[in-house]
């Protein structure tokens, strides 16, 4: 029987992507394992070659079609397994159901891009990517600014309870260097988590006007 | 070699209860994902319930949640499937079977490994 602690997290990015990751202590870190996707009502199946990503665990992305596809729907159920080469045959490690619209983590915002800067505010845009037209308007994002001398971690979060793919900051300092981020989290699924933070935005406030009162 | 020995199946009513045993010998009940599977005269197989392994999470068939749960004892090395409020549909062959592995399934009952001979559940008036 299998010994130690596993687990076997996964998510569905709404679209074609489904990426796991399987950790387990005391497992051997040359062993061969793959992630095995079998649908319950299609005609697919999909597998990926785990790879190591620390001492005790590995990842992998199952890509069931091309990005923009829409390859699962709230009704469908997957059985993911975790296989590991065994000598001649495979061995079963991990199994679960899973319910990709209960379990989803989109793709991080892109194409972030400065609409308008002045010298007390910023309006920044982004887009969503693969993501799935179920969910309509049913997003919400997060955003955080980070300012100098500061860390990501000292950003105070900025929260859009609506699909709003842009924001107008304010109250910024002239003339200075600024960092911006955003995520999206669909408002559907019991385990749906937060995306990725996007790729930093860089800007730049405007210079204060010489003689004028800032 | 893992084995697995069901008992107490019979003939209920409709509305009635039955609880289910499933015996484990030949390994720790610990150490497998654990499934309640059924087999109507005629159709496929079908995951009823399951109890992953080392965390006891519990799942259900939405055609039996709130009715049936599934338990252990591991002083006992059996695991049980409490069935109330039974419907003439619940009627099958019920299977205990166990996978070597983290978790289980409901979906695909083809990936356990080992399986029992089965207990006949009958609910009629």
């Known amino acids: 029987a299998v010994n130690g602690t596993s687990q076997f997290t996964c998510f569905y990015n709404s679209r074609a992507n489904i990426s796991c990751v399987w950790s387990q202590d005391g497992a051997l870190q040359d062993t061969s394992c793959q992630v095995h996707a079998w649908p319950d009502r299609r005609r697919w199946n999909q597998t990926c070659e785990l790879l190591p990503v620390s001492q005790a665990s590995w990842a992998c992305n199952l890509i069931l079609g091309a990005p923009d596809s829409q390859k699962l729907t709230t009704v469908d159920i997957v059985t993911l397994r975790v296989l590991c080469r065994e000598g001649v045959r495979w061995r079963v490690m991990a199994i679960q159901d899973f319910k990709p619209f209960e379990n989803l983590r989109l793709m991080a915002p892109i194409s972030l891009q400065v609409v308008h800067v002045e010298t007390h505010r910023c309006n920044i845009s982004w887009e969503i990517s693969q993501a799935s037209h179920y969910f309509e308007r049913h997003l919400e994002f997060e955003a955080r600014t980070l300012s100098p001398g500061h860390t990501w971690e000292e950003a105070p979060l900025l929260t859009l309870k609506q699909k709003q793919e842009w924001i107008c900051l304010e109250t910024l300092t002239p003339d200075t260097q600024y960092e911006f981020q955003v995520r999206v989290k669909p408002l559907q699924g019991e385990f749906t988590t937060w995306s990725p933070w996007s790729q930093p935005l860089a800007f730049r406030t405007k210079p204060a006007a010489l003689g004028k009162d800032t | 070699e893992v084995q697995l020995v069901e008992s107490g199946g019979g003939l209920v009513q409709p509305g009635g209860s039955l609880r289910l045993s499933c015996a484990i010998s030949?390994?720790?009940?610990?150490?497998?994902?654990i499934g309640w599977v059924r087999q109507a005269p005629g159709k496929q197989r079908e995951g009823v319930s399951c109890?992953?392994?080392?965390?006891?999470?519990?799942f259900y068939a939405d055609s039996v949640k709130g009715r049936f749960t599934i338990s252990k004892d591991n002083a006992k090395s059996t695991v049980y499937l409490q069935m109330t409020n039974l419907k003439p549909d619940d009627t099958a062959v019920y299977y205990c079977?166990?996978?070597?592995?983290?978790?289980?399934?409901?979906?695909?009952?083809?990936?356990?490994?080992?399986w029992g001979l089965g207990t006949q559940v009958t609910v009629s008036s």
């Open positions: 079977a166990a996978v070597d592995a983290y978790g289980c399934s409901l979906v695909q009952p083809t990936t356990y490994d080992f």
């Open positions: 030949g390994g720790t009940l610990d150490s497998y994902g």
């Open positions: 109890m992953s392994r080392s965390d006891d999470r519990t």
